[in-house]
């Protein structure tokens, strides 16, 4: 998996009135590390790990950059002609990546009312627009507005990408997202009996990286997908992840079932407590 830095900005308008301020969050290697505090008008660390490792200068720089991007997004929303009455949102997701072979990627994606209408490759400046006529109209609307803005040159987009990569490299050097392996803590629990069945849940927590296999086995054979229920793999706020898998089994057959976990080349089986 490449190292990545992702920013998600959103501005809202209601009946043509664009809100003051914006909403923003940042993710480093898929982990939330930054949020924009509207009341303080500042970028703030999200999660203890970001607070502990990244210095005050980081939040000053992030605030300046987000404020500028937020103002750009507000101006862009003002120029979208499509706006009918009601609440509307314009969202920009900006991503840059460093791959294991040291190659880099950069892109940004724009969504109007949650619908993607424009993607840009920041390295080649190529744009991709979905086929729908609404997306085509919105993309034309926005790109025409940007053409009027002398700032939005090819140099500007290259600088945007360079700036993102520079930050990503700085954060990686700070050790915030060092490629480390944290093995999961696995816990198996049983819920109350219902019609002779019990639900067994296997929880994996505090692991890194995100990729994990968690599945129930009966007599050493994995159960079929449709007999198991999985939770999403979610960040737990400490730079690590958590997830779960559950299945229903006959009471009295607990010893036949095990939870199988595979993570970063390590694996283990965990029995149902008797």
């Amino acid at each position: 998996e490449p190292h990545s830095l992702r920013y998600n900005l959103m501005v809202l308008s209601q009946d043509g009135s664009v809100q003051s301020g914006f909403l923003a969050e940042g993710h480093l290697d898929g982990q939330p590390f930054l949020r924009y505090d509207r009341q303080k008008r500042r970028a703030k660390p999200q999660g203890q790990w970001a607070e502990n490792v990244l210095g005050a200068k980081t939040w000053d720089t992030e605030t300046e950059d987000l404020t500028e991007n937020g103002q750009d997004l507000r101006r862009t929303l003002t120029h979208i002609k499509d706006q009918k009455g009601g609440l509307h949102s314009l969202q920009e997701i900006r991503v840059c990546e460093i791959h294991e072979d040291s190659s880099t990627r950069g892109s940004r994606h724009f969504y109007y009312d949650g619908e993607l209408f424009l993607s840009q490759n920041l390295e080649t400046q190529e744009s991709t627009v979905p086929q729908s006529s609404r997306a085509q109209t919105l993309a034309m609307n926005v790109t025409n507005f940007w053409k009027e803005d002398a700032m939005k040159t090819k140099t500007h987009y290259r600088a945007m990408q360079a700036d993102c990569l520079q930050k990503l490299q700085r954060y990686l050097k700070s050790g915030v997202a060092i490629r480390r392996t944290v093995p999961p803590m696995v816990n198996v629990t049983c819920s109350e009996v219902s019609e002779g069945n019990i639900t067994v849940t296997c929880r994996a927590s505090s692991f890194y990286p995100r990729n994990i296999t968690l599945t129930w086995r009966q007599d050493g054979v994995s159960l079929s997908h449709n007999t198991q229920q999985w939770g999403d793999v979610l960040p737990d706020g400490n730079g690590t992840y958590q997830t779960w898998v559950a299945t229903r089994i006959r009471q009295g057959e607990e010893q036949r079932f095990t939870c199988y976990m595979e993570h970063s080349g390590n694996h283990g089986t965990h029995p149902v407590p008797s």
Epitope: S17, Q19, S20, D37, R38, R41, R42, L87
Partner: antibody, heavy 116, light 107 residues
Framework: EVQLEESGPGLVKPSQSLSLTCTVT?????????WNWIRQFPGNKLEWMGY???????NYNPSLKSRISITRDTSKNQFFLQLNSVITEDTATYYC?????????WGQGTTLTVSS | DIVLTQTTSYLSVSLGGRVTIACKAS??????LAWYQQKPGNAPRLLIS???SLETGVPSRFSGSGSGKDYTLSITSLQTEDVATYYC?????????FGGGTKLEIK
């Protein structure tokens, strides 16, 4: 504890300029938030006048834009309101307050009368 | 500019009673609304932000609700110290504006 305190002349003549100071203790005005001026007219109506943010950028109420200026002295942790060409309708209690959206800390207010 | 209207200027309620104070915006403000309490001779005090979030130290008998254009401040079990004027304020877009206030008295 965060505290804000307004100070000013109390009485100003029409057409003159009004200058008010807000001294902030317990919090640096350059660390975050926006620092606002709000006034309350004799009939109790409240009006947001404008702010200076921690970074020094300003935002003013368009109804006052041609007459208002908000500045700061970071070494003294103070910010200032200047209102030009005052008229009797500018008679009010003037508050300074902290907040980039809503106002969580307020000064006790200073009463200003515009009269000849 | 967005106008906030507090239609009731005065409210007289019995001690221990329940009171609701309404605030109507001229446009949708999507919960970007705060409520303040002001006692005579004092500055306003923030009670609620984002329409429903109670500020630290504010008694739980205060609550906020609403959406779109219509918002309400509720006080249950009214106490003598709740006698004050209550203002709403939006922060959807500048200029931020306040409602005209609702003065609460004990019957």
């Amino acid at each position: 504890e965060v505290q804000l305190e307004e100070s000013g002349p109390g009485l100003v003549k029409p057409s003159q300029s009004l200058s008010l100071t807000c001294t902030v203790t317990g919090y640096s005005i350059t660390s975050d938030y926006a620092w606002n001026w709000i006034r309350q007219f004799p009939g109790n109506k409240l009006e947001w006048m404008g702010y200076i943010s921690y970074s020094g950028s300003t935002n003013y109420n368009p109804s006052l834009k041609s007459r208002i200026s908000i500045t700061r002295d970071t070494s003294k942790n103070q910010f200032f309101l200047q209102l030009n060409s005052v008229i009797t309708e500018d008679t009010a209690t003037y508050y300074c307050a902290r907040g980039g959206t809503y106002f969580d800390y307020w000064g006790q207010g200073t009463t200003l009368t515009v009269s000849s | 500019d967005i106008v906030l209207t507090q239609t009731t200027s005065y409210l007289s309620v019995s001690l221990g009673g329940r009171v609701t104070i309404a605030c109507k915006a001229s446009a949708h403000i999507n919960n970007w609304l705060a409520w303040y309490q002001q006692k005579p001779g004092n500055a306003p005090r923030l009670l609620i932000s984002d329409a429903t979030s109670l500020e630290t130290g504010v008694p739980s008998r205060f609550s906020g609700s609403g959406s779109g254009k219509d918002y309400t401040l509720s006080i249950t079990s009214l106490q003598t110290e709740d006698v004050a004027t209550y203002y709403c304020q939006h922060y959807w877009s500048t200029p931020w504006t306040f409602g005209g206030g609702t003065k609460l008295e004990i019957k």
